[in-house]
């Protein structure tokens, strides 16, 4: 099985859907935005629903200019985001407190520059292990009902735990349909054995699988976005099968409980 992550670096958004073979794995980032075309094979939460407004105040969008969303991210500190390492770009902008995908101004939004991006040193492109990165913002956020950090869980997830994943990734696969507003999806953590059975020789303890049997899944464009379980940040959208939401092919997420020490130490060393 060839691997494919859920960020799409083909930001021209004209990547034909037939260039990624069915049954391959894909990074879940994307070139989503005003000019996203319906034949782009990247980015989505499948079979989710519109998030309630103000319920995901830690959700961030990483934007290429002019306003093209390519990955999600999570506010974990007043001046720091977490996202997937495979979402790293040298020039990007950060949007917080925004509900719709379109760049239309929203009163709760706050815009930032990333002044430093620090991938986990154990990440290896184009692999999936240690798929996380810290981004330092150019200033501290102004805490509001729309913009607020979330704590990273130090407890590893157990099978059956109910979680919420969110993002602006495409809502269909393999065809593409980008949502108007932030999508939310309830998923359940799977056992590590089920995860390894789904993706033999591709899973390690820096990852966990989650999904359900009803064809619900995250997908490209959602990369780097949050998986929240019991009120704390448990994972980041990382990779999965293509097309998304295939039976017995769950989404794969960065297992943040393994990285709490690195996250804390890196923020402290660079603050």
């Amino acid at each position: 099985v060839t691997e494919h992550v859920l960020a799409n670096n083909d930001v021209s958004c004209d990547h034909p859907s037939n260039t990624v073979p069915s049954g391959s794995n894909q990074d879940l980032g994307a070139g989503a935005g005003e000019d996203a075309r319906s034949d782009d094979s990247s980015s989505r939460i499948i079979n989710g629903s519109d998030c309630d407004m103000h319920t995901q105040p830690w959700q961030a969008a990483l934007l290429l200019r002019p306003n093209q969303l390519y990955c999600g991210a999570v506010l974990v500190h007043p001046q720091w985001l977490l996202t997937a390492a495979h979402c790293r770009k040298k020039v990007f902008r950060v949007r917080l407190g925004h509900y719709s995908l379109s760049p239309v101004y929203e009163s709760g939004q706050q815009m930032f520059q990333g002044v430093k991006s620090i991938p986990h040193p154990g990440y290896s492109h184009p692999g999936h292990s240690n798929d996380l990165m810290l981004i330092k913002l150019n200033r501290r956020i102004r805490p509001t009902k729309d913009v607020r950090p979330i704590n990273v869980s130090s407890h590893c997830p157990s099978a059956g735990t109910k979680c919420l994943v969110s993002g602006w990734g495409t809502t269909k696969s393999p065809q593409v349909h980008f949502p108007k507003v932030l999508q939310c999806l309830n998923i359940s953590v799977l056992s590590q054995k089920r995860c390894e059975d789904a993706y033999p020789r591709q899973i390690d303890d820096t990852m966990f699988c989650a999904g359900d049997k009803a064809g619900r899944d995250s997908c490209q464009g959602d990369s780097g976005g949050p998986v929240v379980c019991n009120g704390s940040l448990q994972g980041l959208v990382s990779w999965g099968d293509y097309p998304c939401a295939r039976p017995n092919r769950p989404g794969v997420y960065t297992n943040l409980c393994k990285f709490t020490k690195w996250i804390q130490e890196t923020i402290q060393a660079n603050s």
Partner: antibody, heavy 117, light 110 residues
Framework: EVQLQESGPGLVKPSGTLSLTCAVS????????MSWVRQPPGKGLEWIGD???????DYASWAKGRVTISQDSSKTQVSLKLSSVTAADTAVYYC???????????WGQGTLVTVSS | AYQMTQSPSSLSASVGDRVTITCQAS??????LAWYQQKPGKAPKLLIY???TLASGVPSRFSGSGSGTDFTLTISSLQPEDFATYYC????????????FGGGTKVEIK
């Protein structure tokens, strides 16, 4: 056509200030980070610093306090100033564009600056 | 501080040879490594970025591998136009860096 063109005085006196500009054409500076790199005669490449569209600037540790990198408001050129120059600053100076994946994909032809009295 | 060390500093090879150049980082730089080719009197040219991604227009005889601290540039079958100096550059961090580039490897005709 995507192009970078460095220009500036070829000769600078010791203790003076080296000033170079890099004219950018064929792409918007607002989408890319730009780097300055130099190469002393017969030696390897030395990174000087990067400037981002947001005007965030990273400098090599040896360059802090001596180097100023800037870009004009119309975003069509990038500038480099190096103060208190010595003979050791004699080099070919290049500007280059980052491809947004941490590779310098477009380079100027370079301009030789000699520090001598 | 992150330091990049290239080896060998020079090598002699013949057309058709397989050539390998290594670059070692003093600390892990994950996969943020680029390789450049420079010919005398010319600006460097990007060959590979993200350790293994071939830049546009670069022949497939060039390949890059490695992650963490150890990286390799391989030319599978050396061509006459490949005699040049090759540099690696880390893109992991710009904080407290003296130089992002390695010292270079000159590939000469045997």
């Amino acid at each position: 056509e995507v192009q970078l063109q460095e220009s500036g005085p070829g000769l600078v006196k010791p203790s003076g200030t080296l000033s170079l500009t890099c004219a950018v054409s064929g792409f918007p500076l607002s989408n890319y980070a730009m780097s300055w790199v130099r190469q002393p005669p017969g030696k390897g490449l030395e990174w000087i610093g990067d400037i981002y569209p947001s005007d965030i600037i990273d400098y090599a540790s040896w360059a802090k306090g001596r180097v100023t990198i800037s870009q004009d408001s119309s975003k069509t050129q990038v500038s480099l100033k190096l103060s208190s120059v010595t003979a050791a600053d004699t080099a070919v100076y290049y500007c280059a564009r980052d491809n947004n994946d941490y590779g310098l994909d477009i380079w100027g032809q370079g301009t030789l600056v000699t520090v001598s009295s | 501080a992150y330091q990049m060390t290239q080896s060998p500093s020079s090598l002699s090879a013949s057309v058709g040879d397989r050539v390998t150049i290594t670059c070692q980082a003093s600390q892990s730089i994950s996969s943020w490594l680029a390789w450049y080719q420079q010919k005398p009197g010319k600006a460097p040219k990007l060959l590979i970025y993200l350790a293994s991604t071939l830049a546009s227009g670069v022949p497939s005889r060039f390949s890059g591998s490695g992650s963490g601290t150890d990286f390799t540039l391989t030319i599978s079958s050396l061509q006459p136009e490949d005699f040049a100096t090759y540099y690696c550059q880390q893109g992991y961090t710009n904080s407290n860096i003296i130089n992002t580039f390695g010292g270079g490897t000159k590939v000469e005709i045997k």
